[in-house]
Every structure is written in structure tokens, then in C-alpha cells.
């Protein structure tokens, strides 16, 4: 984790339910004015939605993101529908970015 890290992490205040990376990212961006959102396990707990803010503009209570915290592992398969009742994504020929294969680990840091 290099010096000058600028992403601060804060548990989402608005996300509930089983964590889904696409929904978490959307919730953090749209509702919490974050840069991004991602699902992670912290300690031995369940996977939760964390929002990532620019540390220089972060809300109270945000802490520097731990090494390799974001972005999330990519979810395999087809994407889930939007979290806020918008139209679901088009079929696979139209913008779904599922990965070919399973879930790689989060990007490593050195």
C-alpha cells in the first residue's frame, strides 16, 4: 500500500441485504456520493457493502482503505438487476460485463 493513498473506506449506510458488487457500487455512488462501492469481508464477519471516498473529501468516520481493499473480486455469471428499480440490464449481447470464469482474488498489493 503506497504512501499517498487517497481512498477512504466507510461501511454503507444505505445498503441492506446480501452484498452484490454491482448493487453496492451503484448504491455508494448514487446515494452516498462515494467514488465507488464494493463488497468485502472485514475480520470474520459477513460480507458487507463498503463505500470508497476521496480521503481529502471524505465524510466523517471514513478510514483509509486497507491494502487491496478495492475493487472487489469480479462476480461470475450474468449481472443482477439494478438495485433501485430501474430497467434491468440488456441481454448478454448488450452490456453485461460478466467475466469468463469464476471470481479472481482482489488485486494484490506489494
Amino acid at each position: 500500500h503506497m504512501a499517498g493513498s487517497k481512498l477512504c473506506e466507510k461501511t454503507s449506510k444505505t445498503y441492506s441485504g446480501k452484498c452484490d458488487n454491482k448493487k453496492c457500487d451503484k448504491k455508494c455512488i448514487e446515494w452516498e456520493k462515494a467514488q465507488h462501492g464494493a463488497c468485502h469481508k472485514r475480520e470474520a464477519g459477513k460480507e458487507s457493502c463498503f463505500c470508497y471516498f476521496d480521503c481529502s473529501k471524505s465524510p466523517p468516520g471514513a478510514t483509509p482503505a486497507p491494502p487491496g481493499a478495492a475493487p472487489p473480486p469480479a462476480a461470475g455469471g450474468s449481472p443482477s438487476p439494478p438495485a433501485d428499480g430501474g430497467s434491468p440490464p440488456p441481454p448478454a449481447d448488450g452490456g453485461s460485463p460478466p467475466v469468463d470464469g469464476g471470481s479472481p482474488p482482489p488485486p494484490s498489493t506489494h
Epitope: H1, M2, G4, S5, K6, L7, N21, K22, K23, C24, D25, K26, I29, E30, W31, K33, Q35, H36, Y52, D54, A65, G68, A69, A70, P71, P72, A74, A75, P79, P82, D84, G86, S87, P88, P89, P90, G94, G95, S96, P97, P104, P106, P107
Partner: antibody
Framework: QVQLKESGPGLVAPSQSLSITCTVS????????VHWVRQPPGKGLEWLGV???????NYNSALMSRLSISKDNSKSQVFLKMNSLQTDDTAIYYC???????????WGQGTTLTVSS | DIQMTQSPSSLSASLGERVSLTCRAS??????LSWLQQKPDGTITRLIY???TLYSGVPKRFSGSRSGSDYSLTISSLESEDFADYYC?????????FGGGTKLEIK
């Protein structure tokens, strides 16, 4: 099938204003963010700004004073407005969709803007 | 702003060759990096997001990796349609910023 298509005036005189439209199909603007990026002739890409699904905007601070992004969800259109144009605003202007949980996954073909008297 | 230093700026290679392009971030971007391909006609297509995740439909000869603040795009065996310009994009912090680009030419 996801598509984005930019349309603009082509030629604008210096100090004038610009309006470029991005018309999308295959997805709804209430579900996705749309970003604007430009590319001056022979140069690299520059991020201009974004309008998110809920209507919130973020801009490149270097251009924020003369840039405005808006949209009409019902018409599936996103608008880029820029004022006080100078010759170095000459570029290809692209719109692109942000797929939540990933990044910019679909791009328009771009529209060329020339700022010249 | 975060500076993305992309290298090399141009590269000549032969069909079937393995090539790697690199982007270095001036600040921590926590893996929020994507790679894009731009064809001579200006068409831009997605390749990779989150540093190493391939978008669906992208050939498996493309791969992305990260080592600290260095991010790499590797094409394992060049095909004729791969000769194009390539850009990295950091989308961790506003303003999002692109690398200067790499022009990949046929030798």
C-alpha cells in the same frame, strides 16, 4: 443491443458555446451513468465528466467552470454543454456508459468538433 | 490529479509475439484501472476492468495484472486485429485520468 451515438455541430467559432447530444439505446439512463471523454487530434483521451443514473454530476475541475452535463431520461439523451470555446477544444467527443461494479463498458463512435473562425 | 504514466508510447511487434504495456499510477488507485483499445477509425472498446478482470467477449489472449502501483496489459499472441492504440484509465478518484496511450504497430 447497447448503443451510444453522439451528435454535434461539427464547427463552432471561438468564444461560442457548444452542445453535443448522446442518444442511447438498449439500456435506460435511470439505471446507468454516462461519461464524456474527448480526444484532441493526434493526442490522448481526456475525461470531462459524468452524469449518474440519479442525475448527480461530477466534472473535471480544469473545465468545470464552463462545462455542464444534463440528461432527459424519457428521450434517452445526455447533453454536454461547454461555453467560451477555444481552438484547443477541437477534439473528438465521446460518450460512454458506466456499468456499475465495473467501468466504462460501451462507447459511442465519437463526434468531431472543430473550433475555428 | 493522479498521473498515469504509460509505456512504451509505441511498440512494433510481429504476429504471434507476446507484448506487455505498462501504466504507473502517481498515487494509490487500489486496482481501479481499466484498459481500452482504440482502432484507427476511432472506435473504442473495453478490454479489462479492476486491473485484471476481462470483460465478456474479450479474447483470452488479453490479460491484466498489477504489481504495486504498476499495472500491465499483456497480449499473449498478437493477432492482426490487435494492432491499435491502447489506453489505461484510472477510475479511483476524480478526475478520472488516462495514460498517454501506446500505439501498437505491426513489424
Amino acid at each position: 443491443q447497447v448503443q451510444l451515438k453522439e451528435s454535434g455541430p461539427g464547427l463552432v467559432a471561438p468564444s461560442q458555446s457548444l452542445s453535443i447530444t448522446c442518444t442511447v439505446s438498449g439500456f435506460s439512463l435511470i439505471s446507468y451513468g454516462v461519461h464524456w471523454v474527448r480526444q484532441p487530434p493526434g493526442k490522448g483521451l481526456e475525461w470531462l465528466g459524468v452524469i449518474w443514473a440519479g442525475g448527480r454530476t461530477n466534472y473535471n475541475s480544469a473545465l468545470m467552470s464552463r462545462l455542464s452535463i444534463s440528461k432527459d431520461n424519457s428521450k434517452s439523451q445526455v447533453f454536454l454543454k461547454m461555453n467560451s470555446l477555444q481552438t484547443d477544444d477541437t477534439a473528438i467527443y465521446y460518450c460512454a456508459r458506466y456499468y456499475y461494479g465495473s467501468s466504462l463498458d460501451y462507447w459511442g463512435q465519437g463526434t468531431t468538433l472543430t473550433v475555428s473562425s | 490529479d493522479i498521473q498515469m504514466t504509460q509505456s512504451p508510447s509505441s511498440l512494433s511487434a510481429s504476429l504471434g509475439e507476446r507484448v506487455s504495456l505498462t501504466c504507473r499510477a502517481s498515487q494509490e488507485i487500489s486496482g481501479y484501472l481499466s484498459w481500452l483499445q482504440q482502432k484507427p477509425d476511432g472506435t473504442i472498446t473495453r478490454l479489462i476492468y479492476a486491473a485484471s478482470t476481462l470483460y465478456s467477449g474479450v479474447p483470452k489472449r488479453f490479460s491484466g495484472s498489477r504489481s504495486g502501483s504498476d499495472y500491465s496489459l499483456t497480449i499473449s499472441s498478437l493477432e492482426s486485429e490487435d494492432f491499435a492504440d491502447y489506453y489505461c484509465l484510472q477510475y479511483a478518484i476524480y478526475p478520472w485520468t488516462f495514460g498517454g496511450g501506446t500505439k501498437l504497430e505491426i513489424k
